[in-house]
C-alpha cells in the first residue's frame, strides 16, 4: 500500500518477538480519531495474498482475511479509537515471523509502517543446587528455547573466567519437535559465591543467579526480548 | 442453529485408550475454536486443551499433554479428543465448548452435552 | 499454574442485584485474562455468559453484565430472576492456557 490522499498521519509500529505457542502481540499506534465509524485497519503480511486481519465501521471483516491467520487474530477494539491499532495474535506458530504492515485510514488521512515480528521460544530458567553429584554443582533449566540458544556461566568471585570446561549442557527436543529443553550443569562449585546461567538466541536472552552461602540459597532470573523498539 | 453433539458414555478399562466425538452444526466449523473440558464431581472444571479445525494448531495443558491428543476433521465438522492410558482419575464428564477469539469479544457460548467415561476394570 | 478463586456459594432473591467474582493467585486480574462466566444447570447444560471480561454473548440478557473490580472479575445479575439459580464458573486465560475458577452455586 502506498499513501495516497492529501493528508499523511503518523503511524508507529514497534519490532517485537513472539512465543511459539502463546499469544503475541503486533505493536502499532496512529493519530487518534474519536470517530470510530470512519478509523480502517489493515494488517498484511510480506509474501502472503489476502489480508493478516481488518478492523474497520467498528467491526471485525475478515472476508479477505488468509487461511493461515483465520481464529487467531484480534485487534483491541476498545482501544482504537485512542489511536491503537496492535493486534493480538493467538499461539503464535513460527511461521509467523516475517513483515508486516500496519496500515490505518482515518478521517484524518492514511499512514503505514512496517514491523519485523521473529518468532521463537524462550523462557526463564531455574537454578538449583544438584546435591546428586559427587561433587558440588548447579543445575541450570529452562524448559522451551528455539532456535538453539547458546550458554555460559559466569561467576562474582572469578569474573572473566571460562568455564566451557567445567560445565556439561544438552539440548533436549520437546515433544512438539521444535522447541528444546536446555539443560546445563556447573561442576565444582564453591560456597558463598554467585553464579549466573546465561542463555541466548537472536530472539531473547535469559539470566539465573544463585548465591550459595552456608545458610541459604538465593534466586534471581531475568528475561529481556533483544533488538525490539 | 448452532449445536456441538457429543459421542455417547464410554465404559473402558484401565490402560485403554478411548476417542470420543464432538460434531458441530450451525456455523463454519473451521472459524472457531473447540475447546475440551473435564468436569469430575467435587473438582470443579478442568481445562485440557484446545484445537483449530483446518489447522494443526493445538494448545493442551501441560498436565494432559501426554493423556489427550485432539483432530478434527473439517469434512463432517467433528472434533475429536483420544485420552490414552486410562486411570480411574480419567473418569469424568468431558466437554466441547466452541470459543470465539475476535476484536470485539473472547468467549466460550456453545457446550456440548458432554460425555461420560467410566474407567474400571 | 495459577488458582482462580470464587465465592462457593451466595444466595439472592428474585430482583435482587447479586456480583460472584473471580480471583486469580497471581495478581490482579486484567483485561488480558479475557475473563469468561459460564453458567451450568442441572444435567449438565452449560451457557456462557460473559466474554473478554465485559461482553455479554449474542442471546445473554442484559440483566448479566461482567466488569473489574478491584484486583477481580465479577459478573453482575441486576434483577435476579429464579430461572438464574444455577452454577457460575469464571475461567481466566493465562496467555497460552484457561484455569477455571471452582464455581460458584448461586441459591
Known amino acids: 500500500f502506498g499513501i495516497s490522499g492529501k493528508h499523511f498521519i503518523t503511524v508507529t509500529t514497534f519490532t517485537s518477538a513472539g512465543n511459539i505457542g502463546e499469544d503475541g502481540t503486533l505493536s502499532c499506534t496512529f493519530e487518534p480519531d474519536i470517530k470510530l465509524n470512519g478509523i480502517v485497519i489493515q494488517w498484511l503480511k510480506e509474501g502472503i495474498k489476502g489480508l493478516v486481519h481488518e478492523f474497520k465501521e467498528g467491526k471485525d471483516d475478515l472476508s479477505q482475511q488468509h487461511e493461515m491467520f483465520r481464529g487467531r487474530t484480534a485487534v483491541f477494539a476498545d482501544q482504537v479509537v485512542v489511536g491503537n491499532a496492535s493486534l493480538r495474535l493467538k499461539n503464535v506458530q513460527l511461521t509467523d515471523a516475517g513483515t508486516y504492515t500496519c496500515y490505518i485510514h482515518t478521517s484524518k488521512g492514511k499512514g503505514n509502517a512496517n514491523l519485523e515480528y521473529k518468532t521463537g521460544a524462550f523462557s526463564m530458567p531455574e537454578i538449583n543446587v544438584d546435591y546428586n553429584a559427587s561433587s558440588e554443582s548447579l543445575r541450570c533449566e529452562a524448559p522451551r528455547w528455539f532456535p538453539q540458544p547458546t550458554v555460559a556461566w559466569a561467576s562474582q568471585v572469578d569474573q572473566g573466567a571460562n568455564f566451557s570446561e567445567v560445565s556439561n549442557t544438552s539440548f533436549e527436543l520437546n515433544s512438539e519437535n521444535v522447541t528444546m529443553k536446555v539443560v546445563s550443569v556447573l561442576y565444582n562449585v564453591t560456597i558463598n559465591n554467585t553464579y549466573s546461567c546465561m542463555i541466548e538466541n537472536d530472539i531473547a536472552k535469559a539470566t539465573g543467579d544463585i548465591k550459595v552461602t552456608d545458610s541459604e540459597v538465593k534466586r534471581r532470573s531475568q528475561l529481556e526480548l533483544l533488538n525490539s523498539g | 442453529q448452532v449445536q456441538l453433539q457429543q459421542s455417547g458414555a464410554e465404559l473402558m478399562k484401565p490402560g485403554a485408550s478411548v476417542k470420543m466425538s464432538c460434531k458441530a452444526t450451525g456455523y463454519t466449523f473451521s472459524s472457531y475454536w473447540i475447546e475440551w473440558v473435564k468436569q469430575r464431581p467435587g473438582h470443579g472444571l478442568e481445562w485440557i486443551g484446545e484445537i483449530l479445525p483446518g489447522t494443526s494448531i493445538t494448545t493442551y495443558n501441560a498436565k494432559f499433554k501426554v493423556k489427550a491428543t485432539f483432530t478434527a476433521d473439517t469434512s463432517s465438522n467433528t472434533a475429536y479428543m483420544q485420552l490414552s492410558s486410562l486411570t480411574s482419575e480419567d473418569s469424568a464428564v468431558y466437554f466441547c465448548a466452541r470459543y470465539y477469539f475476535g476484536s470485539s469479544s473472547f468467549y466460550f457460548d456453545y457446550w456440548g452435552q458432554g460425555t461420560s467415561l467410566t474407567v474400571s476394570s | 499454574q495459577a488458582v482462580v478463586t470464587q465465592e462457593s456459594a451466595l444466595t439472592t432473591s428474585p430482583g435482587d442485584t447479586v456480583t460472584l467474582t473471580c480471583r486469580s493467585s497471581t495478581g490482579a486480574v486484567t483485561t488480558s485474562n479475557y475473563a469468561n462466566w459460564v453458567q451450568e444447570k442441572p444435567d449438565h447444560l452449560f451457557t456462557g455468559l460473559i466474554g473478554?471480561?465485559?461482553n455479554r454473548v449474542p442471546g445473554v440478557p442484559a440483566r448479566f453484565s461482567g466488569s473489574l473490580i478491584g484486583d477481580k472479575a465479577a459478573l453482575t445479575i441486576t434483577g435476579a430472576q429464579t430461572e438464574d439459580e444455577a452454577m457460575y464458573f469464571c475461567?481466566?486465560?493465562?496467555?497460552?492456557?484457561?484455569?477455571f475458577g471452582g464455581g460458584t452455586k448461586l441459591e
Open positions: 473478554g471480561t465485559n
Open positions: 475461567a481466566l486465560w493465562y496467555n497460552n492456557h484457561w484455569v
